[in-house]
């Protein structure tokens, strides 16, 4: 907290500019009008203020807006955003995707922080659902975002938003999350033709049931082993040797290298040895 002192003669700030970097903390407190600061927030980031000076500027904004900053100020916070606490951010009402992007840009390249998490939560709750543009933005900054949501939260994602999801956005999802996302993806991509459909649905297949895998095996999809290894064990177990051979196509030879790992290991144990022998891979059931 900075003491209230009168502004020295001739030092009253007329605008937010470079001259303010030479002001001591108490001079900033006394000589910079909070309303002026709020209207010229976009200039703050161009000026190399010290962290201590930024603390003073934040304090002035807090006094001006005790109930939370308006979006016009939030959008131009820039590096001052890093000074905000989750408690500060919970007072905000951020509705513009541009504001969200501007603040995420400040934290770019860093791990998710409590401040960013609070900001995202406030934004998404305000929107009511995770629309495509929001999801696009969040996964661009944080590829692990989608897989950090609970199955319950994911259930409110509309199928139309699935178009924004890239394969790498699903890398850290668990089977429970994919169980929720897969039916949405199936719905979103239902009008695509066979090969295009497989390219899009492939990264969601960790949530696919047996009957869908059987259907895919009839479509010459040539699923790679990496995708096969991510399938649900309970969905793979009922597949016949012939169906797995059709599903994997030329990649079927890769089963040998994975014979000790799930789901391949469990699937092998369910098959008749005679059927496994037809693959010519030396798999032992």
């Amino acid at each position: 907290e900075v003491e209230k002192t009168a502004c020295p003669s001739g030092k009253k700030a007329r605008e937010i500019d470079e001259s303010l970097i030479f002001y001591k903390k108490w001079e900033l407190e006394a000589c910079v009008d909070a309303a002026l600061l709020a209207t010229q927030m976009d200039r703050v980031n161009a000026i190399p203020f010290t962290y201590e000076q930024l603390d003073v500027l934040k304090h002035k904004l807090d006094e001006l807006y005790p109930q939370g900053y308006p979006e016009s100020v939030i959008q131009h916070l820039g590096y001052l955003f890093l000074k905000m606490s989750p408690e500060d951010i919970r007072k905000w009402n951020v509705t513009s995707l541009e504001t969200l992007k501007a603040l995420l840009e400040v934290n770019k390249g860093h791990e998710m922080s409590p401040q960013v998490a609070t900001l995202i939560d406030r934004f998404v709750k305000g929107r009511g659902q995770l629309d495509k543009d929001t999801l696009d933005t969040l996964t661009a900054f944080y590829p692990g975002y989608l897989c950090s949501l609970s199955p319950e939260e994911l259930s409110s994602v509309p199928p139309s938003s699935i178009w924004a999801v890239r394969p790498q956005d699903l890398d850290t999802c668990d089977p429970r999350q994919l169980d929720v996302l897969y039916p949405k993806a199936r719905l979103a991509f239902q009008n695509m033709n066979g090969s295009e459909y497989f390219v899009k649905i492939q990264s969601f297949l960790g949530g696919a049931p047996t009957e869908d895998l059987k259907a895919l095996s009839q479509q010459n999809v040539s699923m790679d082993l990496a995708t096969f290894m991510k399938l649900r064990t309970d969905a793979v177990l009922p597949l016949t040797v012939a169906e797995v051979q059709k599903l994997l196509g030329p990649h079927v030879e890769g089963l040998k290298a994975e014979e000790r790992h799930r789901p391949v290991r469990d699937w092998i144990l369910r098959q008749r040895q005679d059927d496994l022998d037809t693959l010519g891979l030396g798999l032992q059931g």
């Epitope: 791990e111 998710m112 692990g144 950090s148 199955p151 939260e153 999802c173 668990d174």
Partner: nanobody
């Protein structure tokens, strides 16, 4: 680098209760969970708790164990009731900074805390 420190393990009679705690250094946006390993057995997922507080439990502990987390303090707890001899194991806290897949790299593990239930 995230570090996880568990506490609260110990010995208890069958039918008794214990509360395990886990404190994380560093911010956890992804899942947190409890795993256990009994002598001679494979590691078993006990509970996974998502950031919104939704928890999923292994069938063997459903209704007896309750997991909760505090996102602001980066802590996780496991309330264990009606303990039996089969619950004897080393219990490990796990966390991901983002995401929830325990089977791929990026999982942080605690050192573990021993729980022993005698009948």
């Amino acid at each position: 680098q995230v570090q996880l420190v568990e506490s609260g393990g110990g010995s208890v009679q069958a039918g008794g209760s214990l509360r395990l705690s886990c404190a994380a250094s560093g911010y956890i946006y992804g899942c947190m969970g409890w795993f256990r390993r009994a002598p001679g057995k494979a590691r078993e997922e006990v509970a996974t708790i998502y950031r919104d507080g939704t928890a999923y439990y292994a069938n063997s502990v459903e209704g007896r164990f309750t997991a909760s987390r505090n996102n602001a303090e980066n802590t996780l707890s496991l309330e264990m009731n009606s303990l039996n001899a089969e619950d004897t194991a080393m219990y490990y806290c796990a966390a991901r900074t983002t995401g929830c897949n325990w089977d791929i790299s990026g999982v942080y593990w605690g050192q573990g805390t021993q729980v022993t239930v005698s009948s």
